[in-house]
């Protein structure tokens, strides 16, 4: 379970498609 | 203005821990990602660990997962890297670095004046 | 997974220098190129392929496709004489450098 605290925060993974991007990298979604 | 300033390297022996810090100033902390990026003497980059905005969000190199440790303090706009169980193949220059602003932060814009660390017994 | 560049690349004073950077489906991915000048730290000076920071001269440029990443800079100063490093992720876990390139300007 995430921690309360971080539950506002983005969270960034690495994938393809992602972010309006038509490539791969990192990408960060709250 | 913008900056990133290292501190904690040294001399350690094999085995043994050093923790490192890297103060920020010049920008909101909290917003942005971080990283610990080394380079061995006379050789190229090497990508250590990041950091984003959650703690709970960090990931590793292979090369270091389970002897280091990042983290962040933001009340104190502070980087860390506790390094563990070193290694002869962990000397190297240690840089902090900003990873960029906004949704999709692939590079790395600001950097700090690094700091060495040399494992030798 | 592994970034290869030239060890080395000569130019003359105001001619154009061309940096590459191989890597398996490179093109697929958002490539970086860093300036690192002697007893200096690296500098950010092409981001997501070719937009350049704040900054950074006109003069340098970027591209990627295939399976190649290009570092271009045109009418190269004495002062772009340097290191150069490329940069991508490939996976959460695994951010890739280019072994690096001395740019030495003849």
């Known amino acids: 379970r995430r921690r309360r605290r971080d539950t506002h925060f983005p969270i960034c993974i690495f994938c393809c498609g992602c972010c309006h991007r038509s490539k791969c990298g990192m990408c960060c979604k709250t | 203005q913008v900056q990133l300033v290292e501190s904690g390297g040294g001399v350690v022996q094999p085995g043994r821990s050093l923790r490192l810090s890297c103060a920020a100033s010049?920008?909101?902390?909290?917003?942005?990602?971080m990283h610990w990026v080394r380079q061995a003497p006379g050789k190229g980059l090497e990508w250590v660990a990041v950091?984003?905005?959650?703690?709970?969000?960090?990931y590793y190199a292979d090369s270091v997962k389970g002897r280091f440790t990042i983290s962040r303090d933001n009340s104190k706009n502070t980087l860390y890297l506790q390094m563990n169980s070193l290694r002869a193949e962990d000397t190297a220059v240690y840089y902090c670095?900003?990873?960029?602003?906004?949704?999709?932060?692939?590079?790395?814009?600001?950097w700090g004046q690094g700091t060495m660390v040399t494992v030798s017994s | 997974y592994e970034l290869t560049q030239p060890p080395s690349v000569s130019v003359s004073p105001g001619q154009t220098a061309t940096i590459t950077c191989s890597g398996d489906k490179l093109g697929e991915r958002y490539a970086s190129w860093y300036q690192q000048r002697p007893g200096q730290s690296p500098v950010l000076v092409i981001y997501?392929?070719?937009k350049r920071p704040s900054g950074i001269p006109e003069r340098f440029s970027g591209s990627n496709s295939g399976n190649t990443a290009t570092l271009t800079i045109s009418g190269t100063q004495a002062m772009d004489e340097a290191d150069y490093f490329c940069?991508?992720?490939?996976?959460?876990?695994?951010?890739?450098f280019g072994g690096g390139t001395k740019l030495t300007v003849l």
């Open positions: 950091i984003w905005y959650a703690e709970s969000n960090k």
């Open positions: 940069q991508a992720w490939y996976s959460s876990t695994n951010v890739l």
């Open positions: 997501q392929d070719s």
């Open positions: 010049g920008f909101t902390f909290s917003s942005y990602g």
């Open positions: 670095a900003r990873a960029q602003e906004g949704i999709a932060p692939d590079a790395f814009d600001i």
